[in-house]
């Protein structure tokens, strides 16, 4: 807390300018009017204030706006944003995407800080849902943003926003996040034709159930091995050799290189060896001919 001292004669600030960098902390406190600071916040960024001086300026704004800063001030905070605590930010009501962009720009190139996380949370909650423009903005600054959301937050993403998602935005997603996103993607892309649909849905297939993979296998999609390797093991295991062959098309030859890795390894162990042999790839480890296979899906259909 800076002590209240009178402003020396002739030092009262008429505007926010470069001369203020020569002011001591107590002089800034005494000679800069908080209301003036609030109206000229856009100038602060252009002036090389020290961290200590920025602390004083923040203190002045805090006194002027104890219930939280108005958006007109927030939009021009610039580097002063880095001085804010999550508790400060929780008092704000940020509604403009331009304000959000301006503050994210300050933190650009750095990991998402608790301050930024709180800001985004406040912004999204204020909007009620994660719309396409917001998602576009957030993933541009933080490609892993989508994968940092809770199941509840993801479930509030409208299918229309899925169009903004790029494959790299899903790189760090947990299978449980893909579970939530996949049905939304399916809905978002449902009116596209077969090949276009597959291009769009590909990144989300880590959340696809077996039935959908079976359906895709009937559509000549030619899934590449990289995508196949990202599929859920539990979704791949019930697929027949014929279904996997149709799903991969010409890429089926890639199974040989991946036969020791999941989900290919586990899938091989579930197939009859003579079915695997029909692929002509030399895949080994299937169920020997003559052994009884307990087909759970068949049993399900019979009961």
């Amino acid at each position: 807390e800076v002590e209240k001292t009178a402003c020396p004669s002739g030092k009262k600030a008429r505007e926010i300018d470069e001369s203020l960098i020569f002011y001591k902390k107590w002089e800034l406190e005494a000679c800069v009017d908080a209301a003036l600071l609030a109206t000229q916040m856009d100038r602060v960024n252009a002036i090389p204030f020290t961290y200590e001086q920025l602390d004083v300026l923040k203190h002045k704004l805090d006194e002027l706006y104890p219930q939280g800063y108005p958006e007109s001030v927030i939009q021009h905070l610039g580097y002063l944003f880095l001085k804010m605590s999550p508790e400060d930010i929780r008092k704000w009501n940020v509604t403009s995407l331009e304000t959000l962009k301006a503050l994210l720009e300050v933190n650009k190139g750095h990991e998402m800080s608790p301050q930024v996380a709180t800001l985004i949370d406040r912004f999204v909650k204020g909007r009620g849902q994660l719309d396409k423009d917001t998602l576009d903005t957030l993933t541009a600054f933080y490609p892993g943003y989508l994968c940092s959301l809770s199941p509840e937050e993801l479930s509030s993403v409208p299918p229309s926003s899925i169009w903004a998602v790029r494959p790299q935005d899903l790189d760090t997603c947990d299978p449980r996040q893909l579970d939530v996103l996949y049905p939304k993607a399916r809905l978002a892309f449902q009116n596209m034709n077969g090949s276009e649909y597959f291009v769009k849905i590909q990144s989300f297939l880590g959340g696809a159930p077996t039935e959908d993979l079976k359906a895709l296998s009937q559509q000549n999609v030619s899934m590449d091995l990289a995508t196949f390797m990202k599929l859920r093991t539990d979704a791949v295991l019930p697929l027949t050799v014929a279904e996997v062959q149709k799903l991969l098309g010409p890429h089926v030859e890639g199974l040989k290189a991946e036969e020791r890795h999941r989900p290919v390894r586990d899938w091989i162990l579930r197939q009859r060896q003579d079915d695997l042999d029909t692929l002509g790839l030399g895949l080994q480890g299937g169920i020997p001919n003559g052994y009884l296979v307990l087909d759970l899906s068949m049993q399900e259909a019979l009961s």
Partner: antibody, heavy 121, light 112 residues
Framework: QVQLQESGPGLVKPSQTLSLTCTVS??????????WNWIRQHPGKGLEWIGY???????YYNPSLRGRLIISVDTSKNQFSLRLSSVTAADTAVYYC?????????????WGQGTTVTVSS | DIVMTQTPLSSPVTLGQPASISCRSS???????????LSWLQQRPGQPPRLLIY???NRFSGVPDRFSGSGAGTDFTLKISRVEAEDVGVYYC?????????FGGGTKVEIK
């Protein structure tokens, strides 16, 4: 307020298939962001996670049970089910269904009362 | 699989006194999203488990504030500030960071 209730036979013969259903009331199984789990507890022992299903039909199974296990969902009936084949005495346990998700993983906030399944001839 | 080890196996406590249960995981529970999905559940005799704490220290709604969770990485603690008669039961830690989800072996809290 969401409630879960397990149902199914209390006695299953060895080598047969154990079938249980969990009925969800007070909320929709299709409301996004929740994962519908099966967990079991062997007599006098700790808890073992079996697997979960999302309303879309996507599943994740415990690898120790993979191959014998099918979890399915029927959104029209607001139910999800467990089928465990080739059972042995080691599958004797109290089987619970539970809801996970919401604002975190591991937030298993709603549990069924549990149903005791004995595997015996 | 991540192995969850709880100590002690049993904890006899005097009513009104504090109790502490430790849980250690075989590897870090920090998820790629930087959260740590460690929960604590209580199971009273003859009842299903009940959620107490999730994400290390978040108390679930309706859970008395005498229950608190702490820890990081691989070491976690559940504390009961003043044990009441209704707290008798088995307490489990659970990790939901990595599949398969796994539970600790349980700690039995009983009154001396």
């Amino acid at each position: 307020q969401v409630q879960l209730q397990e149902s199914g036979p209390g006695l299953v013969k060895p080598s047969q298939t154990l079938s249980l259903t969990c009925t969800v009331s007070g909320g929709s199984i299709s409301s996004g962001g929740y994962y519908w789990n099966w967990i079991r507890q062997h007599p006098g022992k700790g808890l073992e996670w079996i697997g979960y299903i999302y309303y879309s039909g996507s599943t994740y199974y415990n690898p120790s049970l993979r191959g014998r296990l099918i979890i399915s969902v029927d959104t029209s009936k607001n139910q999800f089910s467990l089928r465990l084949s080739s059972v042995t005495a080691a599958d004797t346990a109290v089987y619970y269904c539970a809801r996970d998700g919401g604002d975190s993983y591991g937030r298993m906030d709603v549990w069924g009362q549990g149903t005791t399944v004995t595997v015996s001839s | 699989d991540i192995v969850m080890t709880q100590t002690p196996l049993s904890s006899p406590v005097t009513l009104g006194q504090p109790a502490s249960i430790s849980c250690r995981s075989s590897q870090s529970l920090v998820h790629s999203d930087r959260n740590t999905y460690l929960s604590w559940l209580q199971q009273r005799p003859g009842q299903p488990p009940r959620l107490l704490i999730y994400k290390i220290s978040n108390r679930f709604s309706g859970v008395p504030d005498r229950f608190s969770g702490s820890g990081a990485g691989t070491d976690f603690t559940l504390k009961i500030s003043r044990v009441e008669a209704e707290d008798v039961g088995v307490y489990y830690c659970m990790q939901a960071t990595q599949f398969p989800l796994t539970f600790g072996g349980g700690t039995k809290v009983e009154i001396k």
